[in-house]
């Protein structure tokens, strides 16, 4: 196409655009570590900052980690996008009782209207059903099973919604995790972890339950409650969450119903040894960034030690004195070797005594 | 999304060595560090190594001066050279993007690729 040739010289002679012979355009070359919003920016606003997978770029202009939708009662109502998070929502027969930022911490079943009471509203994802009166003289049809059960607490407008958990009879008709189901039985059969914190010293009939919620007439829709700090796992037992409470851990999702609380490292860490919904091991995260390091070229020649900084904190980049040692202390699993044309080693102190409390393992 | 592929691994004698090698796609591969993980049977997963953009390297002690991190930017991949293999290496071995932001909990096994297992067996 010899008139796009005017056009494409003119792009060759501006060091920041490039031609785009694709849609034969002018376009703005994003700088470095920027990356277009589209096939052909044209200025600068069309470039962004590049989010890792289920990551995306909040107002602030940060990474941040879209919100998971993987508990069993949760699903996906918008998909993790560059410019915001996914957003869970509760799965069809459930509404958010406690919501979360872009998700919900806690769904309980919709209200099934008792006797004599009939569908107002329908429940959705957000709200219970309503229950109202049915017109005087008229007797539910009880066609629908729903609108013959007894009522769990008085003739009420709002039935109380039970909360959801794989135990329950509703949850059992329903695939739960791979396909598999949870049998009532389960929910007779629940134990807890050993020795978790937060249950010392509560008496308890059966310790890790909370005291069994009375079922409503005519209806299997109840079950027993792990006690707080304590979440119901795949085989139906009352397993201790674990604790974030080290120094060097930060909580990155709740203690849920159904799913253990999960820790990470707090910012400027990284995990050197994974443990089950936790990290056994934090260590300062050992590499600088870039435009941090201070270090003269002429140095790289020497070895160096560079010194761990106190717990959590990042590595500050300078180099020790010269024959600065690494401290007498550091065991053969607690250090990385710092590698840049010379060796250089980072001793890492390890993290507080590790003492998760999640299965007991 | 970015999809990281592992390959490489196989089995080796102690003492032998193996090259792994982790490719991605070019959109982020230029800008973020990059690390080695590895997980043992029934252990947890243990940082191996990482390397920054501009090359410079880190190693767990376990594998200093066996262990050799490398990046072909061009090629959008990373290396694990692994020499003097012992049996205590035997591990599945993922790489892992951007561990500064990614890895702070007990994830960076398996989160984008498969991994390649790594067996020291006579």
């Known amino acids: 196409f010899p008139q796009d040739r005017p056009f494409e010289d003119t792009c060759h002679g501006n060091p920041s655009h490039y031609y785009d012979k694709a849609v034969r355009r002018c376009c703005y070359r994003c700088p470095m570590g920027l990356f277009p919003t589209q096939q052909c920016p044209q200025r600068p606003t069309d470039c962004r900052k590049q989010c890792e997978p289920d990551y995306y770029l909040d107002e602030a202009d940060r990474c941040t980690a879209c919100v998971t939708c993987s508990r069993d009662d949760l699903v996906e109502k918008t998909p993790c996008a560059w410019n915001s998070s996914r957003v869970c929502e509760c799965r069809p027969g459930m509404f958010c009782s406690t919501s979360a930022v872009n998700s919900c911490a806690r769904c309980f079943f919709h209200s099934v209207c008792p006797a004599g009471m009939i569908v107002k509203f329908p429940g959705t994802a957000q709200k219970n059903t309503v229950c109202e009166p049915a017109s005087p003289g008229v007797s539910p049809a009880c066609a629908s099973p729903e609108n013959c059960k007894e009522p769990s607490s008085g003739t009420i407008p709002q039935a109380k919604p039970t909360p959801v958990s794989p135990a329950t009879s509703s949850a059992s008709t329903m695939p739960v995790r791979g396909g598999t189901r949870l049998a009532q039985e389960a929910a007779s059969k629940l134990t807890r972890a050993p020795d978790s914190p937060s249950s010392v010293g509560r008496p308890s009939s059966d310790p890790g339950l909370s005291p069994t919620q009375p079922c409503p007439e005519g209806s299997g829709d109840c079950r027993k409650q792990c006690e707080p700090d304590y979440y119901l796992d795949e085989a139906g037992r009352c397993t201790a969450c674990v604790s974030c409470s080290r120094d060097d851990l930060v909580e990155k999702t709740p203690c849920a119903w159904n799913s253990s609380r999960t820790c990470e490292c707090r910012p400027g860490m990284i995990c050197a040894t994974s443990a089950t919904n936790s990290c056994a091991r934090c260590v300062p995260y050992p590499i600088c960034a870039a435009e941090t390091v201070t270090k003269p070229q002429d140095m790289a020649e020497k070895d160096t030690t560079f010194e761990a900084p106190p717990l959590g904190t990042q590595p500050d980049c300078n180099p020790t004195p010269e024959n600065g040692e690494a401290p007498a202390s550091t065991s053969p699993t607690q250090s990385l070797l710092v590698d840049s044309q010379a060796s250089k080693t980072l001793p890492i102190p390890t993290s507080a005594p590790v003492a998760l409390s999640s299965t007991g393992k | 999304e970015v999809q990281l592929v592992e390959s490489g691994g196989g089995l080796v004698q102690p003492g032998g060595s193996l090259r792994l090698s982790c490719a991605t796609s070019a959109f982020t591969f230029d800008g973020p560090d990059m690390a080695w993980y590895r997980q043992a049977p029934g252990k947890g997963c243990e940082l191996v190594s990482i390397?920054?953009?501009?090359?410079?390297?880190y190693y767990a002690d376990s594998v200093k001066g066996r262990f050799t991190i490398s990046r072909d930017n061009s090629k959008n991949t990373v290396y694990l050279q692994m020499n003097s293999l012992r049996a205590e290496d035997t591990a599945v071995y993922y790489c892992?993007?951007?561990?500064?932001?990614?890895?702070?909990?007990?994830?960076?096994?398996?989160?984008w690729g498969q991994g390649t297992l790594v067996t020291v067996s006579s």
């Open positions: 892992a993007l951007d561990p500064r932001k990614n890895c702070r909990g007990g994830y960076c096994c398996a989160n």
């Open positions: 390397i920054s953009a501009d090359g410079r390297t």
